[in-house]
């Protein structure tokens, strides 16, 4: 049950040994008690004992003191367990009976007689303190105590809160008097099932399954899991985030396994050869004459050059060689002969020619044979013609070099660069490594070959006002607002201020425009005439004579490329046309023009482009004047100019946009 109503009988007095009906007990009143506990009733009535009932054995005769007894028959205090939430109120009926029969189970005996009874009604809170009471009537007196306590593992005012202390997988706690959990040291959580990790253990990177532990999640290491683990294949690199491989100084490659200073660190080249930090192994040795091998470790034999002629055999000596001549020959290299054509000295079909009036001879050898007597097969590999460890192979009258991977050329003298085929897209920088090329990508691109554009749509935030169309610029953070008629500004935020007396303005504007066009035509004609006469330095001088204000709105000709000769470029500088220039027949090239990228430009970071005004590509032109508008005047069939402005994070820049 959830709780127990306990009743301690202390003393019963029935001095005259009388029953409730006035009769006396013979020889004395052998007394036992019946207890009935039920829900609170204002008037106690017969009926079931809803909270429980219990009977005692015979406890004494007439008057007696009841001793506490913890077990067996006649237990005192009496226990009335209940299995529900204690309501706080009760009704209790205690009856004293006389039995003529069995001492141990008197309630079953016939002929039992009531001595007296008491009824208690009231409220009682759960608690350890006993409430003591005494009830008298004319014949008897009963002293007793009672209380309600919760059963083991039940707590609270009404014994309704179950709490069983535990220290296992499901929790680590003891119970408070009110039934709430009190976690054992090192544990926390509603059910005390969450361990308190080692102090300082990283919240995201670490966890624990028992107190004072710090277990790292994949990719992290250390006491507090705040140190990343480099990539599995990483050799000489570290990380700032898991699985990275940021190379230490002097190391390169995907896994930082390429020694960029191999020559210095390992001195692999022997015998005075030259080492260079290149090639598939990270180094290449260039041998001095007389040495060969990958590390120039093999000394060529003194006999390697076949100095002995006429079939003489060569013997290496400490610092030179010695020729053993065949019969008929003598000299340091067996170059002198004692034979004549009569001795048929020419082998392998060689023909003999007499010399010095027949005292000596010379052999004319067929192809593939050589030597004074045509005794040697031509070996075109003796001179070790193949560089970089290439293998020489005789191929009839010629020879070929079989090159090691990474080399080419007739003599394997050329190092094949994996970067030669420009594998890196979008201006990525290529590095030759043993396992192939590795690309370092510019901002905005990623992937093995920088082929993936990292999309960041600058137009997503809707930066253009008044119904303007937004275009993404050349770099991810740039955008272009194409303004509808009647609006200007980098974001098309300013309406063109037209006064209310509209017709007058229209007329003046019309006249002004006509005059302006005439002036422009005249300027163009004049410029053309001057062009024909003025050499380059004169035009340069003329340029220098312009005011700074005028220069601001001129685009250097070197930066312009116009492949469509019918097109012209016009610079429109707001309503003030006095300082506008027009450039014609100048090429517009924005490959690597320094001024064109503007101050924030990143030359080398963008793929080169040969796009010209003939195609619809915005060109970024730096201008100090934020209101500067540059439009391309298109070929005659085009009827529309587009004035657009490109915004970068730091500055206003002019853009040329052409509609095709």
């Amino acid at each position: 049950g959830s709780g127990i109503f306990q009743l301690r009988l202390q003393e019963f007095v029935n001095q005259r040994g009388m029953l409730a009906n006035g009769q006396s007990c013979e020889p004395g009143c052998r007394t036992f008690f019946r207890i009935c506990l039920k829900h609170f009733q204002a008037t106690f009535s017969e009926g079931p004992c809803t909270f429980g009932n219990v009977s005692t054995p015979v406890l004494g005769t007439n008057s007696f003191v009841v001793r506490d007894k913890n077990s067996g028959s006649g237990r005192n205090p009496l226990q009335l367990p209940f299995n529900f939430t204690w309501p706080g109120t009760f009704s209790l009926n205690i009856q004293a009976w006389h039995t003529p029969g069995d001492d141990l189970r008197p309630e079953t005996s016939p002929g039992n007689s009531l001595i007296s009874q008491i009824i208690i009604q009231g409220s009682l809170a759960v608690g350890k303190i006993w409430r003591t009471d005494e009830q008298n009537d004319t014949l008897t007196r009963l002293s007793y105590s009672y209380r309600v306590i919760c059963s083991d593992n039940y707590y609270g005012e009404s014994c309704s809160r179950l709490c069983k202390k535990r220290d296992d997988h499901f929790g680590h706690y003891e119970c408070q008097p009110d039934g709430s959990l009190s976690c054992l040291p090192g544990w926390t959580g509603k059910y005390c099932d969450q361990p308190i990790c080692l102090s300082g253990c990283h919240e995201q990177n670490g966890y624990c399954s028992k107190p004072d532990e710090c277990i790292c999640r994949p990719g992290w290491q250390g006491r507090l899991c705040n140190e990343c683990i480099p990539h599995n294949g990483c050799r000489h690199g570290t990380c700032s985030i898991p699985w990275q491989c940021a190379c230490d100084e002097g190391w390169g490659g995907l896994f930082c396994d390429q020694d960029l200073n191999y020559c210095t660190h390992h001195s692999p080249c022997k015998n005075g050869s030259t080492c260079s930090n290149s090639g598939p192994k990270g180094y290449t040795c260039t041998c001095l004459p007389g040495y060969t091998g990958e590390h120039c470790e093999l000394g060529l034999s003194k006999c390697a050059s076949n100095p002995c002629r006429n079939g003489g055999s060569c013997k290496d000596q400490e610092n030179s060689y010695h020729c053993l001549c065949p019969p008929g020959y003598y000299g340091q290299h067996c170059e002198h002969s004692t034979l004549t054509c009569a001795d048929s000295p020419c082998f392998n079909g060689g023909s003999c020619r007499e010399r010095n009036q027949g005292s000596s001879y010379a052999c004319e050898c067929p192809p593939n044979f050589t030597g004074s007597n045509c005794e040697k097969k031509v070996d075109r590999c003796t001179s070790n013609p193949c560089a970089n460890g290439g293998q020489c192979q005789n191929r009839g009258p010629s020879r070929t070099c079989r090159c090691r991977p990474g080399f080419t050329g007739t003599h394997c003298e050329l190092h094949i660069s994996d970067c030669a085929r420009s594998p890196c897209a979008h201006g990525g920088t290529c590095h030759d490594l043993e396992n192939g090329p590795v690309c370092t990508c510019p901002a905005g691109f990623s992937g093995r070959r920088c082929e993936v554009r990292i999309t960041h749509d600058a137009c997503a935030s809707g930066p253009c006002f008044n119904g303007a169309t937004c275009y993404t610029g050349l770099s991810p953070n740039n955008f272009v607002c194409n303004c509808p008629y009647g609006f200007v500004g980098s974001r098309c935020e300013f309406p063109v201020g037209l006064p209310p007396s509209f017709p007058w303005v229209a007329v003046s504007l019309g006249v002004g425009l006509v005059v302006l066009l005439v002036l422009l035509v005249m300027v163009v004609v004049a410029v053309r005439q001057l062009r024909l006469r003025r050499p380059d330095d004169e035009s340069r001088e003329a340029m220098n004579n312009l005011s700074d204000f005028q220069k601001d709105n001129l685009i250097p000709a070197a930066q312009l490329k116009n492949t469509n000769q019918k097109k012209e470029l016009e610079v429109d500088c707001g309503l003030d046309k006095s300082n506008c220039g027009k450039l014609q027949n100048h090429t517009l090239d924005y490959n690597l023009a320094p001024g064109l990228l503007g101050r924030g430009g990143m030359p080398g970071k963008y793929p080169h482009s040969d796009k010209s005004l003939g195609e619809k590509v915005p060109l970024r032109l730096h201008s100090e004047k934020p209101e500067c508008r540059i439009s391309a005047i298109c070929s005659p069939r085009d009827s529309m100019y587009q004035s657009v402005c490109l915004i970068s994070e730091e500055r206003n820049e002019c853009v040329i946009a052409t509609e095709v």
Partner: antibody, heavy 118, light 107 residues
Framework: EVQLVESGGGLVQPGGSLRLSCAAS????????MAWVRQAPGKGLEWVAT????????NYRDSVKGRFTISRDNAKNSLYLQMNSLRAEDTAVYYC???????????WGQGTLVTVSS | DIQMTQSPSSLSASVGDRVTITCRAS??????LAWYQQKPGKSPKLLIF???VLADGVPSRFSGSGSGTDSTLTISSLQPEDFATYYC?????????FGQGTKLEIK
């Protein structure tokens, strides 16, 4: 080339001690966590202990806790396993490996045999 | 501890065969699973990590797949040098645990 070379194995009586060493080369040792993994004769692989790179924090499997101590000397590019109170069930080939308890073991040494027998 | 169960325990196959070995974890291990190859008298060699990423220098005939609790190692065309014992290992939970191994033999 990454190389891990173990040494120090041998025959020892139950209750005895042994110290294993592992010499590392071909990578920047101090950045990488290291581990000992063992394999009893004819049996599978069993993780024994790990130690982190720079702060040298150790972790052990329950059955060796209090008996084994993993340590490292980053200046000497060396990893160690001090084994005390050895039992028959500790008999195995002990491998030095580069890796942590929460990552794969990317590189392994050739192993050193430890035999615990009376 | 997380239990790793490999199947089959042993397997006979011929050169050129396609072979599949599976590994089942007693709990979800996400993709933190590695495969190792071990030849008799040699140390294990990492083949695959993060369930499907090929380790450096491992031939492309080896591949890995899986999710949740089940993972698979596949050898698309067996070569003579592939006959060995293969182990899986999880590294999501502490301590790391290995499978009991699958011995791949020549038929």
């Amino acid at each position: 080339e990454v190389q891990l070379v173990e040494s120090g194995g041998g025959l020892v009586q139950p209750g005895g001690s042994l110290r294993l060493s592992c010499a590392a080369s071909g990578f920047t040792f101090r950045y990488f966590p290291m581990a000992w993994v063992r394999q009893a004769p004819g049996k599978g692989l069993e993780w024994v202990a790990t130690i982190s790179g720079s702060d040298e924090w150790p972790n052990y499997r329950d059955s060796v806790k209090g008996r084994f101590t993993i340590s490292r000397d980053n200046a000497k590019n060396s990893l160690y396993l001090q084994m005390n109170s050895l039992r028959a069930e500790d008999t195995a080939v002990y491998y030095c490996a580069r890796g942590y308890y929460n990552s794969p073991f990317a590189f392994w040494g050739q192993g050193t045999l430890v035999t615990v027998s009376s | 501890d997380i239990q790793m169960t490999q199947s089959p325990s042993s397997l006979s196959a011929s050169v050129g065969d396609r072979v599949t070995i599976t590994c089942r974890a007693s709990q979800e291990i996400y993709r933190n699973l590695a495969w190792y190859q071990q030849k008799p008298g040699k140390s294990p060699k990492l083949l695959i990590f993060d369930t499907s990423v090929l380790a450096d220098g491992v031939p492309s005939r080896f591949s890995g797949s899986g999710s949740g609790t089940d993972s698979t190692l596949t050898i698309s065309s067996l070569q003579p040098e592939d006959f060995a014992t293969y182990y899986c290992q999880q590294y999501t939970y502490y301590p790391p645990t290995f499978g009991q191994g699958t011995k791949l033999e020549i038929k």
